[in-house]
């Protein structure tokens, strides 16, 4: 913590300006009034403060606003945002997308994924839902940031907004996030024709249940291997060799390349070797001929 000293009369600060860059840390602490700083935050980012000086300014604001900064201050944080921790940001209430844009721009090129994720979370809470304007802002200023949101926050996305999400925005989404987004996408795109539908739904398919994947196999979609590899393991395992062949079409040859990787490896182990041989790809590891397959999971459910 910065030592408390009294401010020399000649150093008294009446406005936030460039003269402050010559102040030592203890002088800034003693001479800058926190309320003045808050009122003139829009000037701070234009002044080339050192990181040490920014620490002092942050400390001033923390003392003035122990419950969290108001949005009028947050909007003008500029490079001071780089000093914020997720714990600081968690106290904020942010509703303006201009504030979000400003801080996303500042964070670019810095390792601030945790802070940005927390900021986006606060914006979603502040605005009540992940509306189209918020999604548009995220996709424009922070590709991939959508996936930093928790499944709980993503559940506030209305299906009507899903069309604004681009494939690259979902690249870092995990299964739990896709579980939330996929049913919304299916609802949002349900009025499209088969081929157009598949193009739209493809980035979300990591959240699809088996029955949806089976249905796709009946529609000549020729799913690429990258999409197939992102399907949930549990959705792939019940598929027959014939269904996978129809699903992948000409891309079925790619199974050989992915033979040792999940979900392909796990799927191979569940198929009869005879059936795998019909693909002519040399896939090995299937159930040998003459073996009986007992599905104990269904038996357990019945008992």
């Amino acid at each position: 913590d910065v030592e408390r000293t009294t401010c020399p009369p000649e150093k008294e600060v009446h406005e936030i300006d460039e003269s402050l860059i010559f102040y030592k840390k203890r002088e800034l602490e003693a001479c800058v009034d926190a309320a003045l700083l808050a009122a003139q935050m829009d000037r701070v980012d234009a002044i080339p403060f050192t990181y040490e000086q920014l620490d002092v300014l942050k400390h001033k604001l923390d003392e003035l606003y122990p419950q969290g900064y108001p949005e009028s201050v947050i909007r003008h944080l500029g490079h001071l945002f780089l000093k914020m921790s997720p714990e600081d940001i968690r106290k904020w209430n942010v509703t303006s997308l201009e504030t979000l844009k400003a801080l996303l721009k500042v964070s670019k090129g810095h390792e601030m994924s945790a802070q940005v994720a927390t900021l986006i979370d606060r914006v979603v809470v502040g605005r009540g839902q992940l509306d189209k304007d918020t999604v548009d802002t995220l996709t424009a200023f922070c590709p991939g940031c959508l996936c930093s949101l928790s499944p709980e926050r993503l559940s506030s996305v209305p299906p009507s907004v899903i069309g604004a999400v681009r494939p690259q925005d979902l690249d870092t989404c995990g299964p739990r996030q896709l579980d939330v987004l996929y049913p919304k996408a299916r609802l949002a795109f349900q009025n499209m024709s088969g081929s157009e539908y598949f193009v739209k739904i493809r980035p979300f398919l990591g959240g699809a249940p088996t029955e949806d994947v089976k249905a796709l196999s009946q529609q000549n979609v020729s799913m690429d291997l990258a999409t197939f590899m992102k399907l949930r393991r549990e959705a792939v395992l019940p598929l027959t060799v014939a269904e996978v062949q129809k699903l992948l079409g000409p891309h079925v040859e790619g199974l050989k390349v992915e033979e040792q990787h999940s979900p392909v490896r796990d799927w191979i182990l569940k198929q009869r070797q005879d059936d795998l041989d019909t693909l002519g790809l040399g896939l090995q590891g299937g159930i040998p001929n003459g073996y009986l397959i007992l599905d104990l999971s269904v038996r357990e459910a019945l008992s």
Partner: antibody, heavy 122, light 107 residues
Framework: QVQLQESGPGLVKPSETLSLTCTVS????????WSWVRQPPGKGLEWIGY???????NANPSLKSRVIISVDTSKNQFSLKLSSVTAADTAVYYC????????????????WGRGTLVTVSS | EIVMTQSPATLSVSPGERATLSCRAS??????LAWYQQKPGQAPRLLIY???TRATGIPARFSGSGSGTEFTLTISSLQSEDFAVYYC?????????FGQGTRLEIK
């Protein structure tokens, strides 16, 4: 073939929590979305919400604050908890399977349990 | 929320005759509409989805039509087992909503 069976107490006191379980037999719970729908005596149907086997849920906004839907894949079951019940929650509660095929891409129900009547009364 | 309104509330028709049931949505649901049949003490049974596609095992006398906000379920020649309550349901948006039902009774 796949069958659904609801179970739980038929009588719940006002302000308490209604708890029901749906057991899926003859197939895996992992393949579809599963919903709860209710029907007050002599009235129409009301969708409560759905769950995916991973635990992802979506509920009717009119009930969302009181509803918890959960899943137990090891038992092939999913459950409904409705808190702070009143007489208006007296209904036959159905569990149902959402069709879930992209070929028809719809949120409608092709398989239902028989339903269980839950009465809210002191 | 999309409100579904069915009419009439009760329809009296003689066996062998044609029955026409209506369902109106408060806003467009495209063709994302299903019809169910429910008999006393039983769960609903899916009849039609996509406004006009018959579900598996449903007799050809049941047909659906319409899109947007106006939908019709037609039963061409009523059999004794068709007397029941019929519900429409939209799945164009959440929350999924049902009509209040039309009771089809023997005249």
């Amino acid at each position: 073939q796949v069958q659904l069976q609801e179970s739980g107490p038929g009588l719940v006191k006002p302000s308490e929590t209604l708890s029901l379980t749906c057991t899926v037999s003859g197939g895996s719970i992992q393949n579809y979305y599963w919903s709860w729908v209710r029907q007050p005596p002599g009235k129409g149907l009301e969708w409560i919400g759905y769950i995916f086997y991973s635990g992802s849920t979506n509920a009717n906004p009119s009930l969302k604050s009181r509803v918890i839907i959960s899943v137990d894949t090891s038992k092939n079951q999913f459950s409904l908890k409705l808190s702070s019940v009143t007489a208006a929650d007296t209904a036959v509660y159905y569990c149902a399977r959402e069709v879930g095929r992209i070929a028809v891409a719809g949120w409608f129900f092709d398989l239902w349990g028989r339903g269980t009547l839950v009465t809210v009364s002191s | 929320e999309i409100v579904m309104t069915q009419s009439p509330a009760t329809l009296s028709v003689s066996p062998g005759e044609r029955a026409t049931l209506s369902c109106r949505a408060s806003q467009s649901v495209n063709a994302n509409l299903a019809w169910y049949q429910q008999k006393p003490g039983q769960a609903p049974r899916l009849l039609i989805y996509g406004a006009s596609t018959r579900a598996t095992g449903i007799p050809a006398r049941f047909s659906g039509s319409g899109s947007g906000t106006e939908f019709t379920l037609t039963i061409s020649s009523l059999q004794s087992e068709d007397f029941a309550v019929y519900y429409c349901q939209q799945y164009n948006n959440w929350p999924l909503t049902f009509g209040q039902g039309t009771r089809l009774e023997i005249k």
